[in-house]
Interface confidence: medium
């Protein structure tokens, strides 16, 4: 039903998030996402994966800088708010983002290896 | 933020359970008394694969497993005997057990821990 | 008993390499994650880089990323700064420090080891 | 990054009298605040952690509250050994201190 997230999917207010164990690099986690009719995580604000916000880890997520635009965009085009990460000024733009569920952020090369977290939204 | 699906709001949904994932800390017993008010139980660890899921949500977590002394084996809240190793199970003081990172160990049960409840759908 | 030692601190020239270690013991150290912490008198504590338990996840502060590198050896209880390209502000006080078991608190310190860079 | 002052920089007191610190955080840091205490010449000592809660060990003339950006360590009633330097810590964005408070005996 639309209430229900695919097996190995968390649910939590209405979406379905993939939290991957396995690193790899951003495109590859982007690709990995699609297959899944998902798209790596958007982020509406840094309290939106608060259930897990004692991690330690640091996931891809699906911010990355258009030169056309010279922005940091989502997957869907929209651009990244000020207020999520009040230091992405400092972000190198060849690089892409890592994110931790408490609220942090890094930029990284694009060829690191990572974990990531895949979003699908329920309704 | 909206709810749907067939838990708590506020509560995760994952492989047919309902997890309450905690932020506050308390003892062994009081983290039970917090579950049984939300009707549901102290985290029961079925699998590996649930308990590598459990750990990359949160570091460490009590569970609903513990024994009356070292001289008693492991039990579970339906008073099951509780298979799994537990790290530094010869320490006579440490009788309540914690999930911690991948693995499961004794704690004083008397320590403030995080705490996650669980209930099946 | 429960603690960790800092070794390999002491007097090297700017742009030189140092590399330090923390020997844990009395605990199982492979189920913590660790941290370096350096004090100075004039910039007080300053944390440095982290590692997870099973050398993971590896953060850097701003500050020495790209110089420093944290590493482990969970066989042998030891936790490693390589730091390279030292400069005169890197002098301080180095402390290892072990991470409580819900992350980002200081439970158990080493003594410290005095790192001074300088011609 | 997140940046905490503490305030006063000394505190000059004489054992039994009560002592309270202050943290302040530039921007919310929820509860994720803890206090450690220093003395010459050692490594500092965990106190408080998630802004209220004692460690292991601490005696019961500790005490932590506030949540946010304000922050508050107080002792009771000051023993000869709690004369030392204080320092405050978030862990809600990296990990970052406070400059630190003196408590000397007046």
């Known amino acids: 039903d639309c209430c229900s997230c695919q097996e190995k999917w968390v649910g939590y207010r209405c979406n379905c998030y993939f939290i991957s164990s396995e690193q790899k690099t951003w495109n590859e986690s982007r690709h990995l996402c699609a297959s899944q009719k998902s798209s790596l995580l958007q982020l509406q604000n840094t309290d939106e994966l608060d259930f897990m916000s004692s991690s330690q880890q640091f996931y891809w997520i699906g911010l990355s800088y258009s030169e056309e635009h010279t922005a940091w965009l989502w997957e869907n085009g929209s651009a990244l708010s000020q207020y999520l990460f009040p230091s992405f000024e400092t972000f190198n733009t060849k690089n892409c983002i890592a994110y931790n569920p408490n609220g942090n952020a890094l930029d990284e090369s694009c060829e690191d290896k990572n974990r990531y977290i895949c979003k699908q939204q329920l309704i | 933020a909206r709810h749907c699906g067939h838990c708590p709001e506020e509560w995760i949904t994952y492989s047919n359970s309902c997890y309450y994932i905690g932020k506050e800390r308390r003892t062994w017993e009081e983290s039970l008394l917090a579950c049984t008010s939300k009707n549901s139980s102290l985290l029961s660890i079925d699998n590996e694969e649930e308990m590598k899921f459990l750990s990359i949500i949160s570091p460490s977590s009590w569970i609903g497993v513990f024994r009356n002394s070292s001289h008693h084996p492991w039990v579970t809240m339906n008073g099951l005997a509780f298979k799994h190793e537990i790290k530094d199970s010869d320490n006579a003081e440490l009788n309540c057990a914690v999930l911690q990172v991948n693995r499961l160990k004794s704690a004083q049960c008397g320590s403030s821990i995080i705490y996650h409840c669980k209930h099946k759908l | 008993q429960v603690q960790l030692v800092e070794s390999g601190g002491g007097v090297v020239q700017p742009g030189r390499s140092l590399r330090l270690s923390c020997a844990a013991s009395?605990?199982?150290?492979?189920?913590?994650?660790m941290h370096w912490v350096r004090q100075t008198p004039g910039r007080g504590l300053e944390w440095l880089t982290f590692i997870s338990y099973d050398g993971s996840n590896k953060y850097h502060a701003d500050s020495v990323k790209g110089r420093f590198t944290i590493s482990r050896d969970n066989s042998k209880n030891t936790l490693f700064l390589q730091m390279n390209s030292l400069r005169a502000e890197d002098t301080a006080v180095y402390y290892c420090?072990?991470?409580?078991?819900?992350?980002?608190?200081?439970?158990?310190w080493g003594r410290g080891t005095l790192v001074t860079v300088s011609s | 990054e997140i940046v905490l002052t503490q305030s006063p920089a000394t505190l000059s007191l004489s054992p039994g009298e009560r002592a309270t610190l202050s943290c302040r955080a530039s921007q919310s840091v929820s509860s994720y605040l803890a206090w450690y205490q220093q003395k010459p010449g050692q490594a500092p000592r965990l106190l408080i952690y998630d802004a209220s809660n004692r460690a292991t060990g601490i005696p019961a003339r500790f005490s932590g509250s506030g949540s946010g950006t304000d922050f508050t360590l107080t002792i009771s009633s000051l023993e000869p050994e709690d004369f030392a330097v204080y320092y405050c810590?978030?862990?809600?964005?990296?990990?970052?201190f406070g400059q630190g408070t003196k408590v000397e005996i007046k």
């Open positions: 420090a072990r991470d409580s078991w819900d992350r980002g608190y200081f439970d158990l």
């Open positions: 009395g605990f199982t150290f492979s189920d913590y994650a």
């Open positions: 810590q978030q862990r809600s964005n990296w990990w970052t």
